[in-house]
């Protein structure tokens, strides 16, 4: 026997209180698949998060980060502070890359300059905190 709830489309829930008819999701909730017995609470983009896409009855809200921060984790579950190029984020805030390392982005960690001699090459352009070395013949 077919489950009557399977006829309920996205944007609704199968309402047991109303003889399993399909009822619309309440405001600030959604169901992205059919046949659901409840709707899901919409994600709220608050604080350092800002709304990239509003919640609808069939899809959750999507958040990104306010300027000066960038997304981390699946679905932008966290916002991390930006640093300048040539820096990395530590527990004490943004710190300059140590000599011999660089970071050419506003996020991530400082990475060591390329060791040109490993490929039998010489340094053509010196590295900086913001840029890797350029190896030459």
């Amino acid at each position: 026997l077919q489950d009557p709830c399977s006829n309920c489309p996205a944007g609704t829930f199968c309402d047991n209180n109303r003889n399993q008819i399909c009822s619309p999701c309440p405001p600030n909730s959604f169901s992205s698949a059919g046949g659901q017995r409840t709707c899901d609470i919409c994600r709220q983009c608050k604080g350092v998060f800002r709304t990239r896409k509003e919640c609808s009855s069939t899809s959750n809200a999507e958040c990104d980060c306010t300027p000066g921060f960038h997304c981390l984790g699946a679905g932008c579950s966290m916002c991390e502070q930006d640093c300048k190029q040539g820096q990395e984020l530590t527990k004490k805030g943004c710190k300059d890359c140590c000599f011999g390392t660089f970071n050419d982005q506003k996020r991530g960690i400082c990475r060591p300059w390329t060791n040109c001699s490993l490929d039998g090459k010489s340094v053509l352009v010196n590295g900086t905190k913001e840029r890797d070395v350029v190896c030459g013949p």
Epitope: F13, D15, N17, R18, S23, C25, P26, P27, N28, S29, R37, T38, C39, D40, I41
Partner: nanobody, 122 residues
């Protein structure tokens, strides 16, 4: 026991106004998400308006924005829907609804009353 009793419906001409009331008992409307759903003849339920969160933010369906106003009287534990510039397409049974948040994170709603019939016709 949660009870919701709607009143204030009736027959009104296009462009006219009505105020619906919902007297609640068994819970405190100021501490819950509450609103109005309607069912037009031969159609499914539709959310019309709601007061959400303790901050009292409001939701309105696009079709009623600027014409309907939701409010509540906490002392009387009563929810209202002021409807103006009524149109034929507003004809429906209007139910007071309480949003229910389940332990597993799901959301549904409850309509306990019989609803109140609003008919817009000349």
């Amino acid at each position: 026991e949660v009870q919701l009793l709607e009143s204030g419906g009736g027959l009104v001409q296009p462009g006219g106004s009505l105020r619906l009331s919902c007297a609640a008992s068994g819970f405190t409307i100021s501490a819950e998400d509450v609103g109005w759903v309607r069912q037009a003849p031969g159609k499914g339920l539709e959310w019309v308006s709601a007061i959400l969160d303790f901050g009292g933010s409001t939701y309105y369906a696009e079709s009623v924005k600027g014409r309907f106003t939701i409010s509540r009287d906490n002392a009387k534990n009563t929810l209202y829907l002021q409807m103006s510039s009524l149109r034929a397409e507003d004809t429906a049974v209007y139910y007071c609804a309480r949003v229910v948040y389940h332990a597993g994170g799901g959301v549904t709603f409850d309509t306990r009353g019989q609803g109140t019939q609003v008919t817009v016709s000349s």
